[in-house]
Interface confidence: medium
């Protein structure tokens, strides 16, 4: 693959959730996601998963959803191999593993749906001595974790059945998985559950089929069965009101898609703790996310995150539809093993794309909360090194918030041109407008273009063209000049805003390859997420914690929106989990001190529903990261509290967990937190890791933005996957970001091994 | 202390739907997954399918068209209902919590055999 | 569907050292540390050893280990013991679907 950069923009908040193409399975098998739903009344099982982003119906959060421990799925997402990030030992597809190699070790963190699955278990039970496989699916993790291992499996992720009742998209709207590509991050998850087929709602898309049976199942959960793959081309998401594709949007801000910005200074990924929090934070555009595919090349990325001052978060809303990446499926995945998923199971399975998705948009009255806006530029580098410039599917957003304001989301699918593996699916951009004076936060990666803050975000599609997302509603500059009138403190309530999950590139079945990144299909789309060794000089660094409400656009629960607060001011507040104490802010020199501190994240276990488990991944919209000096210490999210919410993109069902969120003594998230919140735009399944990234590259002040952070991850070998992306978890962490998916076998498997405590 | 009973019917005429619960105690079906696995006498264990902590299912795609798998939040259980039954299916049936690679505690297994 | 191929026997003295392969491919073994291993005794429902590819679960003697190489996950016991003997499972997912391997039977001699 080339090296397309991706350039995403940080933001705190977004206005909307940004839909992604459809995700498929790479596996062979597309999970159906029943879209029964569970005997139980109330919010489907999956936290954040909107049915319509993933095209597996989410199933409303259960009262009892809540997840009350993590199971060693969810510790053994946290396992993943934090090793470089190349090396998760999903990612790696012949990567060995020495016996008695720990969980971390094993590089087990990040799995696919499945995985996810299995990972809760095991988390939830360190001491039962249950392994954390869940089902074999589980990710491999602490003991117990063993089911979340299976997860991991290179097999596509299953797409976990939704529950039927859930909300369909509407035809056309869901997510479909044009290619098997999409699947990619699920094979991982097939690898630990094998082809499981989840069957979810009847998917609308083209080629979407209700899956057969199970209807009458009273399951709660979402029936979708992601163990089809799907096949169905991608919905056409309508166009912008304005008239405009969505891509032309992207286009009109004007980048230099591989530039990095202007100034950028490499930071270490903890500068971001030591970003004084003063530094406001616009809300960032809707991801403009692309992930490039590359079956064989690791992707290098290279994150400039640029911290811009005062700008309203508002301004990013605009640009929201997501640029699709397609992603090589896994070695040996490939149409082979999605032929079976082709089949009826994929046309069972097809989940419709969440091409209209929108993000609901924040009441224009509110306040638009200063948060530091961090542009983060992701470079990411086929394993050869060569980037191609050549942009495939370019999806552009409008640089303002305002022309995409009452357009409904648009998430064209477009399947990778070129690309002949099935299980590479390019994400569909999803454009969600969002009126530009909502303060709507979602955090995505957005790609700037040119000065405006719009970023173009480069993917390779597997046939080696490059897509440019488009900025998701960068403001212009002078946008975030007005931004500045309207700020509010920086500081933010401790209460946490709606999971930044929206921030995450989308994990939609666009992207076969995001899919679950731990499915075993798809090595690229397998997320790895080793924490990358910083110089043994520098301290291991806390982030400042940035949460950012992801909102989904179809669904107002999951947008679970905290009433716009003014944000305290955050000059004289400490923030203890991001230790933005060590951050020096100065004015004018924009000069920040970052103290190279590693975070130690070896210590930190995602715990349910912890964002510190979000995967982001590439291609993401901007993600806005808000450097909330949040005293989490005293704060535990309780069952329904929005730190539980997960929100999935595409079905706005918010899943509320019961799991009380300890972030006393631990900047460690817990499962259910927003931390592990992954937004994946298209209604890419969240995958929640415990890897954290530490931003090993120099930290300079970069005086426009404040900061940018330039992260390079180190080439995987053997591993395509692009999801190395890293997120700042509301602790602050960064985390880096496998785009796996809960929605997928892999993810399930992760979530069981890591509940098992894995 | 982490527990999964299955229950059902331990005979069931060919063609007809075998129906199994699983109930659990000691964790949520809510926030664990729930697999099902089968095992014919003397034979590997076969990975029917699961309902993840997200409220997906998965199925194994060669009885997907025939099983189906549902949750109860609300009583802790997890059914799994096939369909179609044949002498092949006899098996001893295990729910378990986890997915697959991770599944940590098993049920003790139900007999459930399939003869007209 | 996928397959997980296991010798189907192996057998091992007391305190010796006995390796038990499962091989996959890049779809499900080799693309990631998500195997699982599993020890069943006949009548019994299986024990989770090993899940993560080397994660030991909880509870499990250290002389277990699982590791992997390329598409084979092998499970590694050191210093057999009697009470070893029994079936071996290996399990992974892929595309969405989770499955054991062939199975191992393991004799201690």
């Known amino acids: 693959m080339a090296e397309p950069r991706q350039e995403f923009e940080v933001m705190e908040d977004h206005a909307g959730t940004y839909g992604l193409g459809d995700r498929k399975d790479q596996g062979g098998y597309t999970m159906h996601q029943d879209q029964e739903g569970d005997t139980d009344a109330g919010l489907k099982e999956s936290p954040l998963q909107t049915p319509t982003e993933d095209g597996s119906e989410e199933p409303g959060s259960e009262t009892s959803d809540a997840k009350s421990t993590p199971t060693a799925e969810d510790v053994t997402a946290p396992l993943v191999d934090e090793g470089a990030p190349g090396k998760q030992a999903a990612a790696q597809p012949h990567t060995e593993i020495p016996e008695g190699t720990t969980a971390e070790e094993a590089g087990i963190g990040d799995t696919p749906s499945l995985e996810d699955e299995a990972a809760g278990h095991v988390t939830q039970e360190p001491e039962s001595g249950k392994v954390v496989q869940e089902g074999f699916l589980r990710e491999p993790g602490p003991p117990g974790l063993s089911h979340q291992l299976m997860s991991g499996m290179p097999g596509a992720p299953l797409l976990p059945e939704g529950p039927r009742e859930a909300t369909r998209q509407p035809s056309g709207t869901g997510p479909e998985d044009t290619e098997g590509g999409r699947h990619a991050p699920e094979l991982l998850k097939h690898q630990l559950l094998g082809d499981l087929h989840q069957e979810g709602p009847p998917l609308k898309g083209a080629g979407g089929k209700e899956r057969p049976g199970s209807k009458e199942e009273v399951d709660e959960d979402r029936d979708v069965d992601e163990s089809s793959p799907q096949d169905s081309p991608p919905s056409k998401a309508s166009p912008a009101q304005d008239g405009r594709p969505p891509q032309t949007a992207a286009r009109e801000a004007t980048s230099i898609p591989g530039f990095p910005a202007e100034g950028a200074i490499p930071l270490p990924v903890d500068f971001l703790s030591k970003v004084s929090t003063e530094i406001p934070a616009s809300e960032p555009d809707g991801p403009s996310v692309g992930r490039a595919k590359g079956q064989d090349a690791p992707l290098e990325f290279t994150f400039h995150v640029e911290i811009t001052p005062n700008v309203q978060k508002e301004q990013a809303h605009s640009e929201e539809h997501l640029g699709r990446a397609a992603f090589p499926g896994a070695p040996g995945e490939g149409p082979e093993a999605r032929g079976p998923s082709l089949g009826e199971d994929t046309k069972e399975a097809d989940l419709p794309e969440p091409s209209e998705k929108q993000p609901a948009a924040a009441p224009r009255g509110k306040p638009v909360s200063r948060v530091p806006q961090l542009k983060a530029r992701m470079v990411s580098k086929s394993k050869d090194g060569t980037g191609s410039d050549d942009k495939k599917a370019k999806t552009s957003t409008r640089s303002s918030a305002k022309t995409l304001k009452n357009r409904p989301c648009l998430s064209p699918k477009h399947p990778t041109p070129g690309s002949s593996d099935p299980l590479i699916q390019p994400s569909s951009p999803a454009v969600c407008p969002e009126p530009p004076s909502s303060p709507k936060y979602v955090s995505s990666v957005t790609s700037r273009t040119g000065s405006s803050g719009a970023k173009e975000m480069k993917l390779k599609g597997a046939d080696g063209k490059t897509k440019i997302a488009t900025p998701r509603g960068a403001a212009p500059p002078g946008q975030k000049g007005q931004a500045n009138a309207t700020r509010i403190p920086a500081k933010t309530p401790p209460a946490p805003k709606t999971p930044p999950s929206s921030g995450e590139p989308p994990k939609s079945g666009d992207r076969s390859g995001y899919s679950s990144p731990g499915s075993p299909g798809t090595p690229g789309s397998r997320s790895r997420t080793p924490s990358l060794p910083t110089p043994p000089t520098r301290e291991p660094k806390k982030v400042a914690v940035v949460r950012t409400p992801p909102k989904s656009p179809s669904s107002a629960k999951s947008r679970l929106q905290t009433a716009p607060v003014p944000m305290p001011d955050l000059k004289n507040v400490k923030s203890k989990i991001g230790s933005t104490e060590n951050l020096k802010h100065q004015p004018g020199g924009g000069k920040v001190q970052i103290i190279n501190k590693k975070l130690d994240l070896s210590n930190v276990q995602s715990k349910c529903g912890s964002k510190d488990n979000i995967k982001h991944v590439p291609g993401g919209g901007s993600v806005q990261i808000v450097y909330k000096p949040v005293d989490l210490s005293k704060v535990t999210s309780k069952c329904g509290s929005l730190g539980n919410i997960h929100h999935k993109p595409g079905g706005g069902q918010v899943e509320v967990k019961s799991e009380k969120l300890d972030f006393k003594d631990r900047v460690q998230s817990k499962i259910g937190s927003l931390d592990n919140i992954t937004h994946v735009p298209g209604g890419g399944n969240k995958k929640i890791e415990t890897h954290k990234l530490t931003f090993r590259e120099n930290a300079k002040a970069k005086t426009d933005h404040g900061a940018e952070i330039v992260y390079k991850s180190p080439v995987v070998s053997g591993d395509t996957s692009p999801r190395h992306l890293s997120n700042v978890s509301s602790t602050g962490s960064i985390d880096m970001v496998d785009s796996p998916q809960l929605a997928t076998l892999a993810d399930e498997v992760s979530a069981s091994l890591a509940k098992q405590g894995l | 202390q982490v527990q999964l009973q299955e229950s059902g019917p331990s005979l069931v005429k060919p063609s007809q739907t075998l129906s199994l619960t699983c109930t659990v105690s000691g964790f949520s079906v809510i926030s664990d997954s729930v697999a099902w696995v089968r095992q014919a006498p003397g034979k590997v264990p076969e990975w029917l399918g699961a309902?993840?902590?997200?409220?997906?299912?998965y199925y194994n795609p060669a009885l997907k068209s025939r099983l189906s798998i549902t949750r109860d939040t609300s009583k802790s259980q997890v059914s799994l209902s096939l369909s179609s039954v044949t002498t092949e299916d006899t098996a001893v049936y295990y729910c378990?919590?986890?997915?697959?690679?991770?599944?940590?505690?098993w049920g003790r297994g139900l007999l459930v055999t399939v003869s007209s | 569907q996928a397959v997980l191929t296991q010798p189907s026997s192996v057998s091992g003295s007391l305190g010796q050292r006995v390796s038990i392969t499962c091989s996959g491919s890049?779809?499900?073994?080799?693309?990631?540390?998500?195997v699982g291993w599993y020890q069943q005794v006949p009548g019994s429902a299986p024990k989770l050893l090993i899940y993560?590819?080397?994660i030991r679960a909880s509870g499990v003697p250290d002389r277990f280990s699982g590791s992997r190489s390329g598409d084979t996950a092998t499970l590694t016991i050191t210093s057999l013991q009697a009470e070893d003997e029994a079936d071996y499972y290996c399990a992974s997912y892929q595309s969405n679907y989770a499955f054991f391997g062939s199975g191992t039977r393991l004799t201690v001699l």
């Open positions: 309902s993840g902590s997200s409220g997906n299912k």
């Open positions: 378990a919590r986890g997915i697959i690679a991770g599944v940590d505690v």
């Open positions: 993560g590819t080397a």
């Open positions: 890049s779809s499900n073994v080799g693309y990631g540390n998500y």
